[in-house]
Amino acid sequence: KSPIFGPQEVSSIEGDSVSITCYYPDTSVNRHTRKYWCRQGASGMCTTLISSNGYLSKEYSGRANLINFPENNTFVINIEQLTQDDTGSYKCGLGTSNRGLSFDVSLEVSQVPELPSDTHVYTKDIGRNVTIECPFKRENAPSKKSLCKKTNQSCELVIDSTEKVNPSYIGRAKLFMKGTDLTVFYVNISHLTHNDAGLYICQAGEGPSADKKNVDLQVLAPEPELLYKDLRSSVTFECDLGREVANEAKYLCRMNKETCDVIINTLGKRDPDFEGRILITPKDDNGRFSVLITGLRKEDAGHYQCGAHSSGLPQEGWPIQTWQLFVNEESTIPNRRSVVKGVTGGSVAIACPYNPKESSSLKYWCRWEGDGNGHCPVLVGTQAQVQEEYEGRLALFDQPGNGTYTVILNQLTTEDAGFYWCLTNGDSRWRTTIELQVAEATREPNLEVTPQNATAVLGETFTVSCHYPCKFYSQEKYWCKWSNKGCHILPSHDEGARQSSVSCDQSSQLVSMTLNPVSKEDEGWYWCGVKQGQTYGETTAIYIAVEERTRGSSHVNPTDANARAKVALEEEVVDSSISEKENKAIPNPGPFANEREIQNVGDQAQENRASGDAGSADGQSRSSSSKHHHHHH
């Protein structure tokens, strides 16, 4: 008895396709070993047609694939464009040779069945409507016209010209004639369901002189489109239901037991499981819309359906589209924290993954808002300036080439709590969702800047110090000047970090920044932060105002300031007078600069593919230095 299981018999029709699922026992070896599909010959040999190692035979070229789903312990063989030559005995199996664990599958491909020559076939999708054409001779023009549906024993009336209508067709069936043509009548049936499928007879007149026509109505449920997505990636369901439902409410639901549970609709309903990671976007007035889900989880796999109805809920006899979503746990998207916690007044550094093959793509960070259909306004991007209300406290640091960019938000308030998306204008699968939780601070912040009310005097020297605890001792400290294009890191010289330390005095760890001489361009936000390599940590922000010197000024005594700066310079051997010119504004502000909303984050066609670097905008350079006081006991 083979532990592999699958369908023993598969039967299909020429030109169609099959999806054969083979199930294997749940072991690590099975999950990773070679999977194959082979055809058994008369000699008992089984010739490989396709395998998970990438082998594809000539006769399957362009029409077959094999996909392993280790999380489900299954693999699927999809074969398209079937011909009668595909009829035969096959094996699906596991192992390095075709003599491993296997299961026998018999595939039979038949010719398309022929209907009697006088039968007219109408093929319609569920929820659509059909207009059946019924020709008749002129002598039957005054006679009764009717359409009936064949059952085993009789032909059950659907509608006739005396306005008799079968109860199950009330409001759905119409019998009419067009213009002055007295040789054809029409029956229109709307909101088709599976129960409407079958053989019909339309008739004009009675007895042997009656005109009859056979009709075969086929009502098809849309075949689910198979979607294979990686864990933590995103999926877009593109739903095109047609102009006739353009003004109806739209929905996406997921099959669950006996119902299809609505996940989101255009009337504001949203499943809490998808909070922060779903958008529904009406595309146009032709009934098209899309639903984007980010941060895919294993439990998101399943059978999805989109549709339209005034209630925003699934309704029989209304058009639908379906998908089967598979979520592959062997994901290329790195596993990162989906919840980031911060405290009021503190900061968070969020590492956003992107496809490393697309290091030049534009990076963005947007805040998901659930009102209406959901939307995600961009707050910052590599070529999108920081939103005004985030001035001085939000920056994006791009680290080209390593597959990660960092977004830092400081001066946190409880209002910042919510869902944020990392996205690029490249590979849309790499959209990720972060939930930011902000708790009330219960202790002093780790980084503190003195003086706190910083006003520098034009032409003089000004120093600010950033105090940090011992736990940050081994990390790199930096100062950067914030602008709405990023936070430009100032050159620093960290002497103390290279000295050996026996102990750490909590009160005396600081990194200082000196402006010498202070110019008007120095006014603005500055950040003090810590990082380890390319991994950013905590930050704190300070606004430095620049004023002209006034008599009786209560500002820091210039002599003291110079002396202090001089100490820093002597100790740190830093040339603090280096000054670089302010970087000019980037001419192309990026795709979301004017319209700052990603109303349809799923529409790649509209996304600009220019590249930029928001983390490297140059401000006027100043110096920062670190001082460490070591106490030997």
Epitope: F5, P7, Q8, E9, V10, S11, S12, I13, D16, S17, V18, S19, I20, T21, Y23, T74, I126, H194, N195, V219, L220, A221, P222, E223, P224, M255, K257, E258, G302, H303, E316, T322, Q324
Partner: nanobody, 129 residues
Framework: EVQLVESGGGLVQPGGSLRLSCAAS????????MGWFRQAPGEEREFVSA???????????YYTDTVKGRFTISRDNAETTVHLQMNSLKPEDTAVYYC???????????????????WGQGTLVTVSS
């Protein structure tokens, strides 16, 4: 809502045949799986056979090892009915046979009870001399 009604059960001698039918009414799907499970007295319910189909007319038939070659599952296209033709019956085939339906098409494991959303009340098959 889908209702499933089984019929065709009864008493048969070893080596004999029976044909079980399962009629589905209410909301029906053009792409779904219908299966047969059985439960012998004091035993757990076990998978017997299943048939999946898609609206393009492709069929997938599944059988458990113990009935392979003796039982045949089929679907009546016009009526939404599935039949299980049981030949060469053995005393160990005695059980209550349940019909089940799933609207998930050809994707879930047809042997797993949790793949099926709708269940019939069951029909008793007794194989005894």
């Amino acid at each position: 809502e889908v209702q499933l009604v089984e019929s065709g059960g009864g008493l048969v001698q070893p080596g004999g045949s029976l044909r079980l039918s399962c009629a589905a009414s209410g909301r029906t799907f053009s792409s779904y799986t219908m299966g047969w499970f059985r439960q012998a007295p004091g035993e757990e319910r076990e998978f017997v056979s299943a048939i999946s189909w898609s609206s393009d007319g492709t069929y997938y038939k599944y059988y458990t090892d113990t009935v392979k070659g003796r039982f045949t599952i089929s679907r009546d296209n016009a009526e939404t009915t599935v039949h299980l033709q049981m030949n060469s019956l053995k005393p160990e085939d005695t059980a209550v046979y349940y019909c089940a339906a799933s609207s998930s098409g050809t994707y879930g494991d047809p042997r797993s009870e949790r793949e099926y959303r709708y269940w019939g009340q069951g029909t008793l098959v007794t194989v005894s001399s």
